[in-house]
Interface confidence: low
Amino acid sequence: LVVYVPPQIGEKSLISPVDSYQYGTTQTLTCTVYAIPPPHHIHWYWQLEEECANEPSQAVSVTNPYPCEEWRSVEDFQGGNKIEVNKNQFALIEGKNKTVSTLVIQAANVSALYKCEAVNKVGRGERVISFHVTRGPEITLQPDMQPTEQESVSLWCTADRSTFENLTWYKLGPQPLPIHVGELPTPVCKNLDTLWKLNATMFSNSTNDILIMELKNASLQDQGDYVCLAQDRKTKKRHCVVRQLTVLERVAPTITGNLENQTTSIGESIEVSCTASGNPPPQIMWFKDNETLVEDSGIVLKDGNRNLTIRRVRKEDEGLYTCQACSVLGCAKVEAFFIIEGAQEKTNLE
């Protein structure tokens, strides 16, 4: 019995309530499609945001803020952003074979809407992506990496002070607005009620205003979308930028894969791996007979000590080898006994 499934586009449930992209950057938009049989085509279309604007005078439903009709093929990018559509990839995601189509915007120069449409013999599915381009403000993370629980992180919102005023930090509420099939998320600047205003500190230099929002001892509850809003000094138009913050959970070290007992002949090589995970990342150390293994020309440790090579093994290399991975959250270890067979040649090596 074959159950046919019309194309379902996976990102819909993950869609962010705003998509704001910095001017001039290269961006990749993705459509992940599940369908049985697989889609015979996935096509991309676009149109300018201004041709599809959410003006109060227009009859627009709350759930569909963009009444878009005139979609153009991405092959015709005249007046829009230069585009390249990559060849479809196939991936096993959540146990299902899915088709992934990616569209690369070479330089984000104009605000536009993009639609991917997937068709198979039993139906079609589509996803509309709001691609709003902003020349500012700009969000940066200090330090520029995902924080781990209990670490501190600052979100910096930088805007040209000759262009923008009234910088404000918000956090999106945990419940995103409901999104219906084929519809766009409501732009965040038009939905300030869904945001929590945050305390922040303002700094200025000769050209920029910088609004810094500090998270001391970040927790998993601090994860989410942070919005910086700035107002154009002349037009008073609001500009919003969103940065998703992920806080990594602290995880004690674990070692994956087994270190196995092995028997090797004199003169051969032994290569073993010890892969550890954890957060913060653990340091790997090797021991032989409970003493730290010293690297020399015959013993090579590589890739952050993950890989141990013993070249030209000798009888004295026999013993109990331990890989230990440690972090502030503790240690994990695995052990194996290496047996060396054969007679030792005489050597005058140092």
Epitope: T292, V294, E295, D296, S297, G298, V300, L301, K302, D303, G304, N305, T309, R311, R312, N348, L349, E350
Partner: antibody
Framework: QVQLQQSGPELVKPGASVKVSCKAS????????MYWVKQSHGKSLEWIGY????????SYKQKFKGKATLTVDKSSSTAFMHLNSLTSEDSAVYYC??????????WGQGTSVTVSS | DIQMIQSPSSLSASLGDTITITCHAS??????LSWYQQKPGNIPKLLIY???NLHTGVPSRFSGSGSGTGFTLTISSLQPEDIATYYC?????????FGAGTKLELK
């Protein structure tokens, strides 16, 4: 890209000591040994020793034991070689080089040490 | 210490020639041999490691072969930028040791 930036030339008197630095960038400093090599004017290359920045483990060629001391500062990804009791025999260009198992895949620009009264 | 004997100590060749430099180890070093190029006034540069592996960015006209005690560096179709001194180095055991070098000149 991998870079090893060494300190500038040294002109020292006999009996004095000198410390040559080698700042590494473009790779994980603690993952690879740092080798030091001497090249006297017009001569071949001579291995002095190595230091493993991960655990400060060192190995020296016999003739350089007591002459050279190798250290590292992990926080700044910098390796150091301290040369003491200098004589004219120690006048040479000294290189640091990133270890790649048994080879040296990237070299500093060299530090010229001249011992002269 | 393992001695590395390089030959010839100097070599004159013409552009486009294929040249070979040999390196002999005083004891078995398996494949733990590297070759370096040093141009006048410049730093040594790794060409070949583990006897025959070309280091990143090194032109394919350079090749290495050998194992045990005998090793060869070959440069096919000599170019003007290949004029330099070439050194071999063993990595079998500490202390690491270098050959005395082969100075390559143009005829």
């Amino acid at each position: 890209q991998v870079q090893l930036q060494q300190s500038g030339p040294e002109l020292v008197k006999p009996g004095a000591s000198v410390k040559v630095s080698c700042k590494a960038s473009g790779y994980s400093f603690t993952d690879y040994s740092m080798y030091w090599v001497k090249q006297s004017h017009g001569k071949s290359l001579e291995w002095i020793g190595y230091i493993d920045p991960y655990n400060d483990d060192t190995s020296y060629k016999q003739k350089f034991k007591g002459k050279a001391t190798l250290t590292v500062d992990k926080s700044s990804s910098t390796a150091f070689m301290h040369l003491n009791s200098l004589t004219s025999e120690d006048s040479a260009v000294y290189y640091c080089a990133k270890g790649y198992a048994d080879a040296m895949d990237y070299w500093g620009q060299g530090t010229s040490v001249t011992v002269s009264s | 210490d393992i001695q590395m004997i390089q030959s010839p100590s100097s070599l004159s060749a013409s552009l486009g020639d294929t040249i070979t430099i040999t390196c002999h180890a005083s004891q078995n070093i398996n494949v733990w041999l590297s070759w370096y190029q040093q141009k006048p006034g410049n730093i040594p540069k790794l060409l070949i490691y583990k006897a025959s592996n070309l280091h990143t960015g090194v032109p394919s006209r350079f090749s290495g072969s050998g194992s045990g005690t005998g090793f060869t560096l070959t440069i096919s179709s000599l170019q003007p930028e290949d004029i330099a001194t070439y050194y071999c180095q063993q990595g079998q055991s500490y202390p690491l040791t270098f050959g005395a070098g082969t100075k390559l000149e143009l005829k």
